[in-house]
Interface confidence: low
């Protein structure tokens, strides 16, 4: 904290400008009013002021307003939201999108920061919704963003916005969200060929449904296991040991080393033994040959 | 046709920063269908990614450089930028800007590339 | 990071032969597995992408195949424009990777 001291005479300052570039920071701290720095706080970002100097004028932000800083404020930051703590942030209340913007701005080249996170989570906190504007807004900053929101969040995400994710972009994503996002991807990927739409709509597979899946059987893509294994298991169990051999293609070799962990496991389960033998990986565990299979609904019919 | 044109300085002194701009004519380096990468080629030697920015700001760079790189475009001038700190010799290289188209996930369009000397 | 391993480093080969080169991730990449075409003093080309769809202009005696790990650039009849170097590149996560290159030269 800079210590307290008198203006030297002369150097009052009567609005922000370059000449305080020069001044010391005990000076700046004791000749800068800090309700004319809040009034003109869109000169600051205009100004050369070294890191020093820009924690003094955070510092007198932080007395002139205890509680959080206006919006007014907020919004005219610039390069002094860098010096914001994730503390700082949580005392906010932002609702304007041009706010989120000029501060998105200037963490514009870098990865999402403790500070860009906290304040994203303010503003839709303050915002009260999640609309098409804020989502466009947030996914071309951080296509990541994506599976940080809620399904319902999700929901009115545009399917423009899937067209900059990358596969670790959904890394962190549950079933539920791409149960959302699946159906999104689909579309914006509809007027792709069949080897480049199953590039881009692979890490999103974990929403597929089964009648995808049968499609997808049909296209020789030669999926991997560990995309497999990202598939909704309610979307796995219909399928055919035959449907499966397809999907898989040569990588149908690696259900062996995936028979105890679901979804495998449970598919295994609900598969006739002997059509599992004709893979001739030694998978066990099927439903024993002679045994009378019912399908589920023909089930519930019948009882 | 969409054409890149690496620009700089052909030698850097030791511990200086290496600057560099690619300039993107016949597209917009605002189309969200890219990324616009950097890559160099020492000597004879392999190619190494350097890092990549999208038309948003966002980047993504190669671990053994982060610290010393900063990649940044500048959409009104169809522009994207490269500084490498405190380089050394080992950061002679053929740097070349290239596209790397989101759908096909390749870089489908490359500069001609610059040939950067590190020497005092 | 994934690490790309090419395989030859170098080979010979006549015009007409049918060429083969390997690339192998350290970890499973899907299909995002690409491959580029080098001649002394220019810029890589793209000639296959997400391991085998071909680019647009490149001579179908280029193909591609793999997926996961292991990944095949095979030229079917080689011409004599083809002596060159090729990489492999994978842009499945970053940072991207490529594979240290294989010189293709006549024999």
């Known amino acids: 904290e800079v210590e307290k001291t008198a203006c030297p005479s002369g150097k009052k300052a009567r609005e922000i400008d370059e000449s305080l570039i020069f001044y010391k920071k005990w000076e700046l701290e004791a000749c800068v009013d800090a309700a004319l720095l809040a009034t003109q706080m869109d000169r600051v970002n205009a100004i050369p002021f070294t890191y020093e100097q820009l924690d003094v004028l955070k510092h007198k932000l932080d007395e002139l307003y205890p509680q959080g800083y206006p919006e007014s404020v907020i919004q005219h930051l610039g390069y002094l939201f860098l010096k914001m703590s994730p503390e700082d942030i949580r005392k906010w209340n932002v609702t304007s999108l041009e706010t989120l913007k000029a501060l998105l701005e200037v963490n514009k080249g870098h990865e999402m920061s403790p500070q860009v996170a906290t304040l994203i989570d303010r503003f839709v906190k303050g915002r009260g919704q999640l609309d098409k504007d804020t989502l466009d807004t947030l996914t071309a900053f951080y296509p990541g963003y994506l599976c940080s929101l809620s399904p319902e969040e999700l929901s009115s995400v545009p399917p423009s916005s899937i067209w900059a994710v990358r596969p670790q972009d959904l890394d962190t994503c549950d079933p539920r969200q791409l149960d959302v996002l699946y159906p999104k991807a689909r579309l914006a990927f509809q007027n792709m060929n069949g080897s480049e739409y199953f590039v881009k709509i692979q890490s999103f597979l974990g929403g597929a449904p089964t009648e995808d899946l049968k499609a997808l059987s049909q296209q020789n893509v030669s999926m991997d296991l560990a995309t497999f294994m990202k598939l909704r298991t309610d979307a796995v169990l219909p399928l055919t040991v035959a449907e499966v051999q397809k999907l898989l293609g040569p990588h149908v070799e690696g259900l062996k080393a995936e028979e105890r962990h679901r979804p495998v496991r449970d598919w295994i389960l609900r598969q006739r033994q002997d059509d599992l033998d004709t893979l001739g990986l030694g998978l066990q565990g099927g439903i024993p040959n002679g045994y009378l299979v019912l399908d589920l609904s023909m089930q519930e019919a019948l009882s | 046709q969409v054409q890149l044109q690496e620009s700089g300085p052909g030698l850097v002194k030791p511990s200086q920063t290496l600057s560099l701009t690619c300039t993107v004519s016949g597209g917009s380096i605002s189309s969200g269908d890219y990324y616009w990468s950097w890559i160099r080629q020492p000597p004879g030697k392999g190619l190494e990614w350097i890092g990549y920015?999208?038309?948003?700001?966002?980047?993504y760079y190669n671990p053994s450089l982060k610290s010393r790189v900063t990649i940044s475009v500048d959409t009104s001038k169809n522009q994207f930028s490269l500084k490498l700190s405190s380089v050394t010799a080992a950061d002679t290289a053929v740097y070349y800007c290239a596209r790397e188209d989101v759908v096909k996930g390749a870089f489908d369009i490359w500069g001609q590339g610059t040939m950067v000397t590190v020497s005092s | 990071d994934i690490q790309m391993t090419q395989s030859p480093s170098s080979l010979s080969a006549s015009v007409g032969d049918r060429v083969t080169i390997t690339c192998r991730a350290s970890q499973s990449i899907s299909s995002y597995l690409n491959w580029y075409q080098q001649k002394p003093g220019k810029a890589p080309k793209l000639l296959i992408y997400?391991?085998?769809s071909l680019q647009s202009g490149v001579p179908s005696r280029f193909s591609g195949s793999g997926s996961g790990t292991d990944f095949t650039l095979t030229i079917s009849s080689l011409q004599p424009e083809d002596f060159a170097t090729y990489y492999c590149q994978q842009s499945y996560s970053t940072p991207l990777t490529f594979g240290g290159g294989t010189k293709v030269e006549i024999k």
């Open positions: 997400a391991a085998s």
């Open positions: 920015i999208y038309y948003s700001g966002s980047t």
